[in-house]
């Protein structure tokens, strides 16, 4: 603790001019006062004195009024500091001196004499109230007040409680009457050392170094840092925890870039074809006759399908077709004959049958030749066996297709994804998008193509279980745990029996 | 019992970047009641406060020091960090951490055994 | 730029006397202020903080006090270990200082 007694003299009254022992002054009392600060008596007694001492120069001469003075000699209140707890009790001797030598420092003078003395004893209280009080005895009178105040930055009703203002990054307080800390606006804790963050910004997943801030941990976004992260890379998909990826619905795949109803969103199919979500593209078109192309949007000639038989020529009308008969056949598609095998109808070496009692007949055609007449040669692109666009070719006895540029395949089924020209750099995993491949990179890689060599390789440390893979690059300043079936968690640590999950991150 | 283990003796070149570490065991640095300082002693001088750090990343530095270095902190492995990006010859000093607590008023009751800067061509 | 000076630069005592190690700035007294205690090839030991308070494993020989423009230290009676360099530390805002140092060496 640390306070300072202090005793403000007032009026000293000395009429006569009169020693302690009786003799008078020549030519009058020059007064000097020695106050002695001890601790309670209930019987003062010479001896140290334990709170302080301190003594005056000469004040005045017989009676005399004493002004306040705040500095040099003669200050006026006298100030007692001490450096302990107040204890709430005192002693104090206030004694009145003569001094025939110097004023200002008459301690030292031989031939001092005593005036008078008063001895208060008694309790007292911290505070800026000043206790007044007046001694007289047969002879004099002193008026005096005192009080007890505590020390700058000591507070308490003993001053033992320092506190010290601060507006730092140790605390932002200010100091209570009873040194207790009152903390500045935007602060809190028992030091006023932690900013009270922007209200609802939320518990764990934000922080504020100041007050009114917040500031979202790695994972989380938004003004409260309370919307998490997804996955980098999700298109169609949420999450309920950083780094997710919960595909909306009808969107799959890792990155949920896979439409599941690419159907229903995109209505790809033209010409009343129907629809499919399947095939490499996410749809297949099964066209209507007369429709052909990716998406059934090329329309056929009518005379396409080769609807006349035997032989019959083919002509496109606005809205259909006629077909010319041979000799011998008659019908809308010239199916009616009025020959018989004496006719010798069948080309190319095929054989005849009769049918019908021998009204009519059947070709049975030799390979690679076909038609009700065997007139035809076999055209295996009649079918037309190629997808995506693709050309249909005669070679012989077989055909072939040959592909537009991103197909492959004996049927130019399969699409040549962008990834088929390996563009990840060591060891990336290509995913096709919409927008051109992505990579996810193996431990130690990263950048689009995986060719940043990461100096600090979060993986390296091995932090996935049960043969997960590892990979760096997904989230900041971390890792992702891809688990294999039947495993889930941060690190892929726990067994569950229910299907594989998206990647946890650690 | 809290220590602060510091990365060893450095020896570099004007124009070069450094950066060394103390790594804190036997207590959390994302502790509310610790800031983490960093202190140089240049050859037979005083100490002199380079700056400190909070678990959160929140900095202060010495104003005539500022701009010269940063202090940073990697809270998963325990540790904060000093880094220079070009060392000058006067960056030749004893570095020390110090933990920084709240609760002594700014004292530092524990320091790291120092780490030896030495920059020169 | 806030200043803490420290004097004497170097204090000569022999053991078992008194050593005051002055520690100056301006209203420091409105400001904590630590006391350190360093010896050749060792790093830096807290002996004072908060003014006046000692460290549980620091000997009440040790004490120290702090108002107006200045702290003090203060070794009651000096024993061999206690000669070292001795350095003040207090904030400014949010800047740590240090004194200069005193040198506490045996008479």
């Known amino acids: 603790g640390s306070g300072i007694f202090q005793l403000r003299l007032q009026e000293f009254v000395n009429q006569r001019g009169m020693l302690a022992n009786g003799q008078s002054c020549e030519p009058g009392c020059r007064t000097f006062f020695r106050i002695c600060l001890k601790h309670f008596q209930a019987t003062f007694s010479e001896g140290p004195c334990t709170f302080g001492n301190v003594s005056t120069p000469v004040l005045g001469t017989n009676s005399f009024v004493v002004r306040d003075k705040n500095s040099g000699s003669g200050r006026n209140p006298l100030q007692l500091p001490f450096n302990f707890t107040w204890p709430g009790t005192f002693s104090l001797n206030i004694q009145a001196w003569h001094t025939p030598g110097d004023d200002l420092r008459p301690e030292t003078s031989p031939g001092n004499s005593l005036i008078s003395q008063i001895i208060i004893q008694g309790s007292l209280a911290v505070g800026k109230i000043w206790r007044t009080d007046e001694q007289n005895d047969t002879l004099t009178r002193l008026s005096y007040s005192y009080r007890v105040i505590c020390s700058d930055n000591y507070y308490g009703e003993s001053c033992s409680r320092l506190c010290k203002k601060r507006d730092d990054h140790f605390g932002h307080y200010e100091c209570q009457p009873d040194g207790s800390l009152s903390c500045l606006p935007g602060w809190t804790g028992k030091y006023c050392d932690q900013p009270i963050c922007l209200s609802g910004c939320h518990e764990q997943n934000g922080y504020c170094s100041k007050p009114d801030e917040c500031i979202c941990r790695p994972g989380w976004q938004g003004r409260l840092c309370n919307e998490c992260i997804p996955h980098n890379g999700c298109r169609h998909g949420t999450c309920s925890i950083p780094w997710q990826c919960a595909c909306d619905e009808g969107w799959g795949g890792l990155f949920c870039d896979q439409d599941l109803n690419y159907c229903t969103h995109h209505s790809p199919c033209k010409n009343g074809s129907t629809c499919s979500n399947s095939g490499p593209k996410g749809y297949t078109c099964t066209c209507l006759p007369g429709y052909t192309g990716e998406h059934c949007e090329l329309g056929l000639s009518k005379c396409a399908s080769n609807p006349c038989r035997n032989g019959g020529s083919c002509k496109d009308q606005e809205n259909s077709y006629h077909c010319l008969c041979p000799p011998g056949y008659y019908g809308q598609h010239c199916e009616h004959s009025t020959l018989t095998c004496a006719d010798s109808p069948c080309f190319n070496g095929g054989s005849c049958r009769e049918r019908n009692q021998g009204s009519s007949y059947a070709c049975e055609c030799p390979p690679n030749f076909t038609g009700s007449n065997c007139e035809k040669k076999v055209d295996r692109c009649t079918s037309n066996p190629c997808a995506n666009g693709g050309q249909c070719q005669n070679r012989g006895p077989s055909r072939t297709c040959r592909c537009r540029p991103g197909f492959t395949g004996t049927h130019c089924e399969l699409h040549i994804s962008d990834c088929a020209r390996s563009p990840c750099a060591h060891g990336g995993t290509c995913h096709d998008l919409e927008n051109g491949p992505v990579c996810t990179c193996p431990a130690g890689f990263s950048g689009r193509r995986c060719e940043v060599r990461i100096t600090h390789d979060a993986c390296a440390s091995g932090p996935c279980f049960n043969g997960a893979t590892c990979y760096t690059g997904l989230s900041p300043n971390n890792f992702v745990c891809n688990c294999p079936y039947g495993f889930v968690g941060s690190r892929c640590e726990f067994p569950v029996g229910l299907p594989p999950s998206f990647p946890w991150v650690a | 019992e809290v220590q602060l283990v510091q990365s060893g003796t450095e020896v570099k070149k004007p124009g070069e970047s450094l950066k060394i570490s103390c790594k804190v065991s036997g207590g959390s640095i994302s502790s509310s009641s610790y800031y983490w300082g960093w202190i140089r002693q240049m050859p037979g001088k005083g100490l002199e406060w380079i700056g400190d750090?909070?678990?959160?990343?929140?900095?202060y530095y010495n104003p005539s020091l500022k701009s010269q270095v940063t202090i940073s902190v990697d809270t998963s492995f325990n540790t904060f960090f000093l880094q220079w990006s070009s060392l000058k010859a006067s960056d030749t000093a004893m570095y020390y951490c110090a933990r920084e607590d709240v609760i002594l008023r700014g004292g530092s009751d524990y320091w790291g055994q120092g780490t030896m800067v030495t920059v020169s061509s | 730029e806030y200043v803490l000076t420290q004097s004497p630069a170097t204090l000569s005592v022999s053991p078992g006397e008194r050593a005051t190690l002055s520690c100056s700035g301006q209203r420091l007294g409105d400001k904590y202020a630590s006391w350190y205690q360093q010896k050749p090839g060792q790093s830096p030991r807290l002996v004072i903080y908060e003014d006046s308070k000692r460290p549980s494993d620091i000997p009440a020989r040790f004490s120290g006090s702090n108002s107006g423009d200045e702290a003090t230290l203060t070794i009651s009676s000096l024993q061999s270990e206690d000669f070292a360099v001795y350095y003040c530390?207090?904030?400014?805002?949010?800047?740590?200082?240090f004194g200069q140092g005193t040198r506490l060496e045996i008479k």
């Open positions: 750090i909070y678990y959160t990343g929140s900095t």
């Open positions: 530390q207090a904030w400014d805002r949010d800047t740590g200082v």
